[in-house]
Amino acid sequence: VPDKTVRWCAVSEHEATKCQSFRDHMKSVIPSDGPSVACVKKASYLDCIRAIAANEADAVTLDAGLVYDAYLAPNNLKPVVAEFYGSKEDPQTFYYAVAVVKKDSGFQMNQLRGKKSCHTGLGRSAGWNIPIGLLYCDLPEPRKPLEKAVANFFSGSCAPCADGTDFPQLCQLCPGCGCSTLNQYFGYSGAFKCLKDGAGDVAFVKHSTIFENLANKADRDQYELLCLDNTRKPVDEYKDCHLAQVPSHTVVARSMGGKEDLIWELLNQAQEHFGKDKSKEFQLFSSPHGKDLLFKDSAHGFLKVPPRMDAKMYLGYEYVTAIRNLREGTCPEAPTDECKPVKWCALSHHERLKCDEWSVNSVGKIECVSAETTEDCIAKIMNGEADAMSLDGGFVYIAGKCGLVPVLAENYNKSDNCEDTPEAGYFAIAVVKKSASDLTWDNLKGKKSCHTAVGRTAGWNIPMGLLYNKINHCRFDEFFSEGCAPGSKKDSSLCKLCMGSGLNLCEPNNKEGYYGYTGAFRCLVEKGDVAFVKHQTVPQNTGGKNPDPWAKNLNEKDYELLCLDGTRKPVEEYANCHLARAPNHAVVTRKDKEACVHKILRQQQHLFGSNVTDCSGNFCLFRSETKDLLFRDDTVCLAKLHDRNTYEKYLGEEYVKAVGNLRKCSTSSLLEACTFRRP
């Protein structure tokens, strides 16, 4: 019988008492084969973290800073359940640390040196750790002691709880730096009052502070937020303009064998029986013998953290950067106005080799990072392990939901002004063999399908979105008899036609021979009935243009397109017979790397782009013999986006809506994780 006991870690006598009460009350409402609680008492949260890592306990609830400690080796814990606040309909699991300024003050985030600052308190998250952690590398050296460096950075501050004798500048705006509400500038409301009164130029608080202190919109409109990209936004746009997004209170467990499903089962049942307004005799979110025992008293319930989410993703790049800066105290030697090498994310070994070749030719301007799937690459860009990659529109959508931004678009048509003119897009098509003359868009049920990969535009989102509208369910593996859709579950019928060997079967990378545009077309040639690809795929792989043995004798005339009206047309008539227009592939990055990625890629394409005529003797960025490595092989240039610089603007309303509709069919664990951070 599997052990269904969750060993909860308590850090005080009062917590241990509440834990025992929790244990006893759960016993009375949960059947004997259900989850149960045992209590383990430790002296501190850090001791609890160590105990969980050592398998002496299973769970504890932590503030964000401790979630970071819990994640660090050798602890390697991960978030599994989040407390939420507010209502069940609009649950808040995170708050945003923001920098508030007066509207007419005219400076940006990178111009804070010499300004007067208002902090909630020394060592507090939104008021000190996050802003000072993010500004850390701009502080004057020596940066230790930190208080001295901060005092020399700002021209005056109020940092309650600081030592006013040693660091008088930190108490200049609030003499004495009192560490309680007796100091009018203490805490969130106090720091905001410090700004409001004109004592300071900037207040470091949380997003709700301004709403709690100014009920009137007209009053709030006198203030703005400083954004990390050195712009400003209105105070209600905090989701797009903050210093960090911080989880409030989180249950952590071991990454491996951590009982995360059992912990969720336990807490979900606990909130049903003993949550807000559920029971008189025991309340999960109440602490008669103290405050915030086991869980925060202000919590309203629990939400399961998506399994794909590790601590780095959960805490977010900005928060991790700030805390790491403070803890490790290391700063890059390079001057901050100079671009560091761009770390390109390469999928599997084929792309890695091309990336290495690019790295050698770029003389270190490009570095390479490997991942096995596109989603793994996106996650690496999110957490700073990588900086950029070029993505199909379907993944631009996921990357956008994860906070990344498009920076340049692949262009596929030769024009005089290629770099300045992003194209409208390419066509997603359905290709069949001419010999299968009875096949139409209306009788695809039971046929064998070939897809570039799950989640990609031409190969999945567009055809499956259209199909979903017809069949009203997500069981595409039942609609087609079999197929190859790399990225599907391995036991799915949509992996049956794939050709990868062993663990590479149906993998969404080049180790699966039927992956990508060329792979999906090869799947049609060798096994399938229909391939969902782009309009250039057939001409690029027929007439001897692809020298591979399977393709060298193919003729474009032997293939036709399926039109949505039930007719068929020759391949060259794609403009009048396609499934939809697809947004071109685009390079994505984090907001903080946008300018450098843009600059370095434009330099790189001038050196290695389509102006290089002899690719046999020189490195060519946009060539890989039909394998579409790093970029599509038909890329002519990378074009500026002008004002289409968010994923919604880039992809367009119609495509975003189409992918949004397909979300209910999504198997993307990354999309699930990112929408947890930003619903």
Epitope: H349, H350, E351, L353, K354, D356, E357, V360, N361, V363, S616, G617, N618, F619, S624, E625, K627, L629
Partner: nanobody, 117 residues
Framework: QVQLVESGGGLVQPGGSLRLSCAAS????????MAWYRQAPGKQRELVAG???????TYAGSVKGRFTISRDNAKNTVYLQMNSLKPEDTAVYYC???????????WGQGTQVTVSS
Amino acid sequence: QVQLVESGGGLVQPGGSLRLSCAASGSIFSINTMAWYRQAPGKQRELVAGITRSGTTTYAGSVKGRFTISRDNAKNTVYLQMNSLKPEDTAVYYCTDYSSSYYQDYWGQGTQVTVSS
């Protein structure tokens, strides 16, 4: 296709030196960027050093200042001079001509380098 033959490996003491050679034959008109990779037991193959046709070089951080890559286009040979060798440099060393390898997965046999006292 290009054929590549690596040589020059062996057993050497920490602090010692070795010079690896890689001779290319076959359709060598297309050789552009060449590189040395290494693979230690149980580890991924990693880029050690690379050189373009015009002689521009790049090195992995762990070998910078100790290893030097060079090439002799007339002899279709690329070299890796390894100085101040450390035990962590122990691996099988492979050379590659990129234009072959990332399309056809072509790698030579490699040459074993062991740094041990």
